[in-house]
Structure formats: C-alpha cells, structure tokens
Amino acid sequence: GIAIPRNSGCPNSEDKNFPRTVMVNLNIHNRNTSTNPKRSSDYYNRSTSPWNLHRNEDPERYPSVIWEAKCRHLGCVKADGNVDYHMNSVPIQQEILVLRREPRHCPNSFRLEKILVSVGCTCVTPIVHHVA
Amino acid sequence: GIAIPRNSGCPNSEDKNFPRTVMVNLNIHNRNTSTNPKRSSDYYNRSTSPWNLHRNEDPERYPSVIWEAKCRHLGCVKADGNVDYHMNSVPIQQEILVLRREPRHCPNSFRLEKILVSVGCTCVTPIVHHVA
C-alpha cells in the first residue's frame, strides 16, 4: 500500500481507514512527450526480435488507448533476414497502472487497476532441455 | 483527455470544468499477479541484449518502487558469449502513469504523472549513415 505521511495543509480525508479513496488531479504532469510508439522509434522493425504494435482501446479505462506488442516470429531474425530457430523471440512485459471507471460510465470515479502489457520483444537463448 | 459519458448513480462532481479532479479507489484490482521483474522471468540475463534492473524508489510517488532497465552492452551478445559491435543493444521504453503526491507528503491528494521507463533491452541493426 501507500505509506501515509501526515501534513497540515493537505486536503481533508473523511475516511478513517484512509487511504481507500483519494483525490487525483487529472491535469497530467508529463515528464516527457507522449507519442504513438510507432513514431517514437523504429526499434520494433529493426530488432532481431521484431514486433507488431496492436491498438487496444477501452473507453472505460484511462488511458483509453494502450499499444500492445506482439512478437512477429518465434525465432529471431538473422543478418540475412531469415529466421534463426535456435533462438527465441519473447515479449518483454510490464505491469502498469491504469484508471478504470467505477461504477461503469461514471466520469469522475475510478479505481486503480494493474494490467500486464507487452512493450516489445527481445531475443533470448532457449532453455535447453536435454532429451534422454 | 477522458471522454465523459453521463450516468445517474455516479458520485457527484462539484467542478464545472470537470474532470480536473476525480475520486480514485486505491484498492487495486490486479488483473495479474504482481512480481519482482527479476523473479518473473530470466529474460534479462538470457537476452542477446541483456540488461540490469535498477530499483528506483520515491515515497512521494505511487508506485513508490519502479524497476528501470539498463542495457549491459552497447553491442549484442553472440552465441559464443562475445559482444557483436555491429549490432546495438537499445532500451525499450514505455510511458507509464504514476500518482504523485500533491501537495507533497499529503496522503490523500495526488496528481497523475506520466513518466518514461526502460522496461528491457532489444538488439537492433544499427542505422548506417553513409559518409559522402
């Protein structure tokens, strides 16, 4: 959970078992420019474990659009463009926070939700299981 | 921003220029099990573009701990374990939402913030700039 330092000058909390519900300012402070990941870099195409980006849209969620990576090959791409099946492309996944409208369709009430997204792919050596 | 469907049965909004500030329930609905990324897979070690994971902690942020990937090499690791400098290890970055306490140290008041994190690394063919 969140450790709760106390401070006068903070907005009041009515809930004794605080913090269950908090106030969140949606004027996002952006520490970097937000871009469509396809535009921000072409790694998805130049990688030895290339991936496609799929648009996942959900109006009941913020952000409503999340880009999901899907590896293009089970193997990895060699310098000659062919697939090397002795190596494996795997998705790099990350857990992210999103806001889910709760109750549904409500404009000003949300619940935090953790979802797992695939951000891109990397090329790994397979775990070799020796056959007896 | 967030499209605002109207619905009776929703908590009230006092702000005319809504939604600036919304109520967020912090009882996280977890769509997957949350794990330390080091434990969840060993891709960071088996990748041809291996990375180290650095713990970034900030008590004024939720989540307070974020793991940042840093590529180990400029090049990519070959089958023989040597680094191939004709290829490049690059970080795969993703913009994520975090909650930033605002005012500082306040337990029940936050602002949404977007930050860019490196999730892992991938091996890419370098862009070749031809010299005239």
């Epitope: 899907k70 089970l74 463009g81 998705p91 775990i127 056959v131 | 891709y43």
Partner: antibody
Framework: QVQLQQPGAELVMPGTSVRLSCKAS????????MHWVKQRPGQGLEWIGE????????NYNPKFKGKATLTVDKSSSTAYMQFTSLTSEDSAVYYC?????????????WGQGTTLTVSS | DVVMTQTPLSLPVSLGDQASISCRSS???????????LHWYLQKPGQSPKLLIY???NRFSGVPDRFSGSGSGTDFTLKISRVEAEDLGVYFC????????FGGGTKLEIK
Amino acid sequence: QVQLQQPGAELVMPGTSVRLSCKASGYTFTSYWMHWVKQRPGQGLEWIGEIDPSDTYTNYNPKFKGKATLTVDKSSSTAYMQFTSLTSEDSAVYYCARSGIYYDYYEDYWGQGTTLTVSS
Amino acid sequence: DVVMTQTPLSLPVSLGDQASISCRSSQILLHSNGNTYLHWYLQKPGQSPKLLIYKVSNRFSGVPDRFSGSGSGTDFTLKISRVEAEDLGVYFCSQSVHVPTFGGGTKLEIK
C-alpha cells in the same frame, strides 16, 4: 468464412517457371501469415516458406531458398509462389495455408491445393 | 531440421473403438514463451489437411470433443475416443517452433 482458393492444376515444361496463386477471402488478409507447403504423391508435407502480407516480409525453408519466391497482391488479397528451374522433382501438390502470428503460429486453414505436373 | 516420427504408419480400427497415434520429435518443442508448438491435422483422400489440435491439446473450432491431444517435451499423443467413419484418413503431426516440419503420417482405416 475463411477461404483460400487455388487453381486445380498446372502443366509446365521442365526448365521453365510457374507462378501459383492463392486468393484469400473471409478474413483480413494482412493480419495473417501465408505459408506454402509441398506434398508429393504418397509422401509427407514439406514447408516451403511464409510471407507476411502486411509488409511482404518473407522467410524460407533453406531447402527452397532460391527455388521459390513468395509475393502478395494486397489489393486482390492474393498470395503467389513463383517456382523456377522446374524438374520432375517439383511435380507435387502445392498448398497455401494461413497462420496467425507468434502465439497463434500454426496453419489453421488450407487451400485445396494446386497439382503441378512438370513434364515434356 | 526437426524430425517428426509418427507411429504406427497404419492403424486399422473398428468403428466405435478408441484410436491412439504417437508423435515423437527429435528436439524439444517448448518455446521460451511457455508454449509448445505441436499440432495435429487430418487429411482425407483428395482433400487438403484440416487442423484438429493446436499447441498440444487445444481443439480447433468445430472439432468434435472425441479428439484430444496430450504430451510434452518430445512425446505427444492424439487420441480419438470413439472412431467414426468420417474420421478415416491420414493424420499428421507438425511442429512450428523450429523450421516447420511434419510427421510422415498415420493412416486410420477400417479393420
């Protein structure tokens, strides 16, 4: 429903080339890989290669590299396989088959096949 | 290439009997993503192959539940619980985790 339409038969002379076609319908052509598979009479199935219609990326079985060339025409949702320097060994049924990507990487729908006969 | 070995070559059965076909691969078919890419097809005379089972044990849409797949690593089995006339034909296993290859086929026929 998903359909992959192939001509029934082709008769060609040794030493020449042939272009086999596969017209897709009933799904989004660019969302699935297209594979080509060879089957000789009484023998097993041999994978020739695959093409991603969205960007025409190709990947070949090393055995068929230089022999087969895969292309697509997105406007007509048609995949093609060009086969060169034909010999009697190339006489076979050639199937096109689609597959999903990555987690869904298996041929789920197949064309009826084109019987290629190489004979003088 | 990964060699896929099917046994038996021919399987005579009576209608209503259980049938079992084995497929062994020369390499492990488990991918680093946790999936095992072993699939089963049925080819009836004069037709193209039809997908029955994908990734070891998942029935493709429209495939009757009398078909089931199992196995792991390098050893896999296709079972038909009660053989019907429409099940006759040649069964192929295939793998797609390496350069895709197919087994030699098992002919299911009436005893």
